[in-house]
């Protein structure tokens, strides 16, 4: 069940989630919780027209959870 | 169908470093929110979790084991590696691939049986 | 380190009977519990994930439960292939634990 090329995914469709309707995959604990239990959007920049992404800001390497600064709020789809 | 088969080297001598290969089908580790973890089971006892990889590269040691692993991914083979250096017979195992979703591990292997033997 | 204290190790009943096996988490996990049940030959396979929820194929009269700091892995009437062993796992962070696992036998 080969995927096509990542690219294309990318630009044609917004990531896929891996939690239930409801549901958030959370970056700072990596794994699903409620959407209403992530953290509020960062601030958008002056100038910005769009939100500016959620992006996690973890270490490459970890031993614990907790080292990320944020989250993805992309809700489950059925 | 997601799949994943890990192999191994099968017996290996005290202080030598111990490379498995999980390969994996069915999913890819670079959609957003996958990874891929090992566990270990020595005969007799409970799984013991030891490592796991994201998708982004985020990796994620065992304290306890930390200075001895090594987890690597190679996403266009479908693959991710585990290294433990300077193995000891209190490594001996079945050594399991696993992989993670957005609710722990949904999908495991069959395991790799490892003996650490002088 | 959150420790996952699961009970009873071993656990002797009889097909048709009700048990139930739990695990308690040292710190709050939430809902991020997995039941895995694994065969004689090693065979691992997931249960349960969120603490409740059913995985496809995995027959009704498995389910999951919490109250508190305790999870429980319920089966509703036991069979036969149901006499192996079971783990739960927390996921809600690394270091992931596992429950000491517990030992279904025949009575």
């Known amino acids: 069940m080969r995927r096509g090329p990542r690219s294309l995914r990318g630009r044609d469709a917004p990531a896929p989630t891996p939690c239930v309707p409801a549901e958030c995959f959370d970056l700072l604990v990596r794994h699903c919780v409620a959407c209403g239990l992530l953290r509020t959007p960062r601030p958008k920049p002056a100038g910005a027209s769009s939100p500016a992404p959620r992006t996690a800001l973890q270490p490459q390497e970890s031993v614990g959870a907790g080292a990320g600064e944020a989250a993805l709020p992309l809700p489950g789809l059925l | 169908q997601v799949t994943l088969k890990e192999s191994g080297p099968g017996i290996l001598q005290p202080s030598q470093t111990l490379s498995l290969t999980c390969s994996f089908s069915?999913?890819?580790?670079?959609?957003?929110?996958?990874?891929v973890g090992w566990i270990r089971q020595p005969s007799g006892k409970g799984l013991e979790w030891l490592a796991h990889i994201w998708w982004d590269d985020v990796k994620y040691y065992n304290p306890a084991l930390k200075s001895r692993l090594t987890i690597s991914k190679d996403t266009s083979k479908n693959q991710v590696f585990l290294k433990i250096a300077n193995v000891d017979t209190a490594d001996t195992a079945t050594y399991y691939c696993?992989?993670?979703?957005?609710?722990?591990?949904?999908?495991w292997g069959q395991g790799t049986a490892l003996t650490v033997s002088s | 380190d959150i420790q996952m204290t699961q009970s009873p190790s071993s656990l002797s009943a009889s097909l048709g009977e009700r048990v139930s096996l739990t695990c308690r988490a040292s710190?709050?996990?939430?809902?991020?519990l997995n039941w895995l049940q694994q065969e004689p030959d090693g065979t691992i396979r997931r249960l349960i994930y969120?603490?409740?929820r059913l995985d496809s194929g995995v027959p009704k009269r498995f389910s999951g439960s919490r109250s508190g700091s305790e999870y429980s892995l319920t089966i509703s009437s036991l069979e036969s292939e149901d006499f192996v062993d079971y783990y739960c796992l927390q996921y809600a962070n690394s270091p992931y634990t596992f429950g000491g696992g517990t030992k279904l036998e025949i009575e």
């Open positions: 969120a603490t409740s």
């Open positions: 696993g992989r993670i979703g957005g609710y722990g591990f949904d999908y």
């Open positions: 710190q709050d996990i939430g809902s991020s």
């Open positions: 069915g999913f890819s580790l670079s959609t957003f929110a996958m990874g």
